[in-house]
Interface confidence: low
C-alpha cells in the first residue's frame, strides 16, 4: 500500500547500556476520515479524550505493523521478521534495546473497509542510540518500586537528572492510556495502591533547527510491601520425630516461608548431626512453591535411599536464613514398630556395617 499519506511521528529511544529496558510504540491513528478505525484525534497534551481506542474496548480493531527497510525494499511484516518485537493490540513492544531497532515502523488497520481507510496509517521514524554513561550518574531506573501505603514517585528516566524547573512538559501514559494529571518529569503518588503498578511511558519533545523529536522512555512500576522484619519460619516438618521403616527410602521435606525482601537471598540447607559431628548434605535444589506479594514459600528435600540403624541415631536439621536471621528445625527418626520382616533388618544391618567402615575411614576422630 502507499505509505505517502501516512501521518508521521519521529521518536528517539536513548537506551541505557547499564540496564535492561523495553520500548513501546503506540498506533496513534489520526481522524481526518470518517472511519471507525480512525476515530482518535491527534490529541494535544492538554486534551483528554473520553475514550482512547485500542485499550480496553471490546471491538478492538486489528492493526497490522510493518517495518520499512532503509534500502527501499518492500515493507516487512513485524511478526515474521522480528521475534524480539511483540505486537500487543495497538502497541508494539521492543523487548531488547539496540541500535538495530532504528527504522521506520508503520501501522494501519488490518481490515480496509472503505477508500478512506487506505490513508489511515501512522509512520513512526524511530532512532535508537545508547545513552552516554557520563550524562547522569543517578538517572532513574526503568524498573521502579513503590511502597504500598506510603508516598512515592515515578520518575521519567530520560529527564531524571534535570530539576523540575528545567524540565520540559512531559506526557505520561499508563498501560497505554493518557494520564492527564501531570505534565512534570515525575508523577507523585500520595498513597500507593496496588493499581499504581503497570507500564508507564513518558514523552517529551526535543527540537533542533531541522526538526523535532519525541523522546520516549518506558518505566515498569511494581508496588511492593516493605521488607520483612522477621526471620523465615519453617512450616514443615512440624514434628521433631518421624516414624520410618528400616531399609526403605525416605524423603524429608523442609518448607519455609520467607517474608518479602527487595534484595532476596534466601538460604535453605539440610545438615546432619551425629554425636559431635555435623555436616551439610548435598540435596536437590530448593524450589519456590508459592510466591505472593507478602512472602515466598520455598521447599527443599533430603532424600535417603535406604534408612539405616545409624540414621536412627542421627539428627536431620533444616536450616533457613534471610537477612534478618535464621531458623532451624530438627528431625529425629524413630523406627516404626512391627513394620519390616527379618530380611529388612538383616539388609539394614548389612548397609549399616558397610557405612560404618566407610564413615570411620573418613572421620578418624569419630567416637
Amino acid at each position: 500500500f502507499n505509505i505517502s499519506g501516512c501521518s508521521t511521528k519521529k521518536l528517539l529511544w536513548a537506551y541505557s547500556t547499564r540496564s535492561e529496558e523495553e520500548f513501546i510504540l503506540f498506533c496513534d491513528l489520526p481522524e481526518p476520515q470518517k472511519s471507525h478505525f480512525c476515530h482518535r484525534s491527534q490529541l494535544s497534551p492538554t486534551q483528554v479524550p473520553d475514550h482512547l481506542p485500542f485499550t480496553d474496548s471490546k471491538d478492538l480493531p486489528d492493526v497490522q505493523w510493518y517495518r520499512q527497510p532503509s534500502n527501499g525494499d518492500p515493507l516487512e511484516d513485524i511478526r515474521k521478521s522480528y521475534p524480539h518485537i511483540i505486537q500487543d493490540k495497538c502497541t508494539l513492544r521492543f523487548l531488547t534495546p539496540g541500535v538495530n531497532n532504528t527504522g521506520s515502523y508503520i501501522c494501519r488497520p488490518k481490515m480496509i473497509k472503505s477508500p478512506y481507510d487506505v490513508a489511515c496509517c501512522v509512520k513512526m521514524i524511530l532512532e535508537v542510540k545508547p545513552q552516554s554513561n557520563a550524562s547522569c550518574e543517578n538517572s532513574a531506573s526503568h524498573k521502579q518500586d513503590l511502597l504500598l501505603g506510603s508516598t512515592g514517585s515515578i520518575s521519567c528516566p530520560s529527564l531524571s537528572c534535570q530539576s523540575d524547573a528545567q524540565s520540559p512538559e512531559v506526557t505520561w501514559y499508563k498501560n497505554g492510556k493518557l494520564l492527564s494529571m501531570t505534565r512534570s518529569n515525575r508523577i507523585v503518588v500520595d498513597e500507593v495502591y496496588i493499581y499504581h503498578q503497570g507500564t508507564y511511558v513518558c514523552d517529551y519533545t526535543q527540537s533542533d533547527t531541522a526538526s523535532s523529536w519525541t523522546v520516549r522512555a518506558v518505566v515498569q512500576v511494581r508496588t511492593i510491601v516493605g521488607d520483612t522484619k522477621l526471620k523465615p519460619d519453617i512450616l514443615d516438618p512440624v514434628e521433631s520425630t518421624l516414624e520410618v521403616e528400616l531399609g526403605k527410602p525416605l524423603t524429608i521435606s523442609c518448607k519455609a516461608r520467607f517474608g518479602f525482601e527487595r534484595v532476596f537471598n534466601p538460604v535453605m540447607k539440610w545438615y546432619i548431626k551425629d554425636a559431635d559431628l555435623e555436616w551439610e548434605v548435598s540435596v536437590p535444589e530448593a524450589k519456590s512453591i508459592k510466591s505472593t506479594l507478602k512472602d515466598e514459600i520455598i521447599e527443599r528435600n533430603i532424600i535417603l535411599e535406604k534408612v539405616t540403624q545409624r540414621d536412627l541415631r542421627r539428627t536431620f536439621v533444616c536450616f533457613v536464613q534471610n537477612s534478618i536471621g535464621n531458623t532451624t528445625q530438627s528431625v529425629q527418626l524413630k523406627e516404626k514398630r512391627g513394620s519390616g520382616g527379618l530380611n529388612d533388618i538383616f539388609e539394614a544391618q548389612k548397609i549399616e556395617w558397610h557405612e560404618t567402615v566407610r564413615f570411620q575411614s573418613h572421620h578418624h576422630h569419630h567416637h
Epitope: 471490546k58 501505603g149 510466591s291 506479594l293
Partner: antibody, heavy 123, light 107 residues
Framework: QVQLQESGPGLVKPSETLSLTCTVS????????WTWIRQPPGKGLEWIGY???????NYNPSLKSRVTISVDTSKNQFSLKLSSVTAADTAVYYC?????????????????WGQGTTVTVSS | AIQLTQSPSSLSASVGDRVTITCRAS??????LAWYQQKPGKAPKLLIY???NWESGVPSRFSGSGSGTDFTLTISSLQPEDFATYYC?????????FGQGTKVEIK
Amino acid sequence: QVQLQESGPGLVKPSETLSLTCTVSGGSISNYYWTWIRQPPGKGLEWIGYISDSGSTNYNPSLKSRVTISVDTSKNQFSLKLSSVTAADTAVYYCARETIVVRGFYFYVMDVWGQGTTVTVSS
Amino acid sequence: AIQLTQSPSSLSASVGDRVTITCRASQGISSALAWYQQKPGKAPKLLIYEASNWESGVPSRFSGSGSGTDFTLTISSLQPEDFATYYCQQFNSYPWTFGQGTKVEIK
C-alpha cells in the same frame, strides 16, 4: 493457621449504627488487606470494603456514605461500622483476609474467611 | 461496577456427573476471577483464583478456565460433598463484585 472471628450485636434498631469487630488469631494483621462482605438471607454476596494494615481503605460506592472500616494492629483486630441501618442491611456479615498473589501481575484472593455473624435490623 | 452473570442459577446432578458452571462479565476482566464454594450456614471457601489456579488443598476435580468476559468452573466427577452453591468473583476493578450464585443440587 490464621483464623478470623466476627463479633458484635446480633440485633440492631433501624437508623442506628451497626458495629462489628473481626479478631485475627494465629497470624499477624500486618502485610494483608482485610475485607468485609455481607450476604442477605437467601441472597448472594456483596463486597463492603477493605482496609490495609496501614489503614488505607476502599469502600463499595453503594455503601460508601455509611461505611467506616478501621484497624487496630495492636489488638490484631479490624472493625466495621455501618450507620443509618434499615431492614435491607439484615445479613450475615463475613470478614475475610485478602492476599495478593504475584504471577507477573497481581491477583487478589480472599483465602481466609470468618464463619460469619448474623445481624438483624429490627425495632 | 462490573456485573457477573452466572448460569445456570441452579442445576440438579448425580454423583459422578461432570458439571459446568459459567460466569460472564459485563466487560473484560483479563483473568482476574475467583471461584468460591459455599455450603449452607458456612462461609464461602476459595476454590480457584486467577481464573484457573487451584487454591492449595482443593481437589483436582475442580478446574477453572476462561479469560476476558467468559469463564467456566468444571467439576469433572461430582462427589457427595460438592453439593453446594458456587460463586464467581471479579478482582479486576473496584468494587469487587460476585455472581448471583449457582446452586448444585442432588438429582
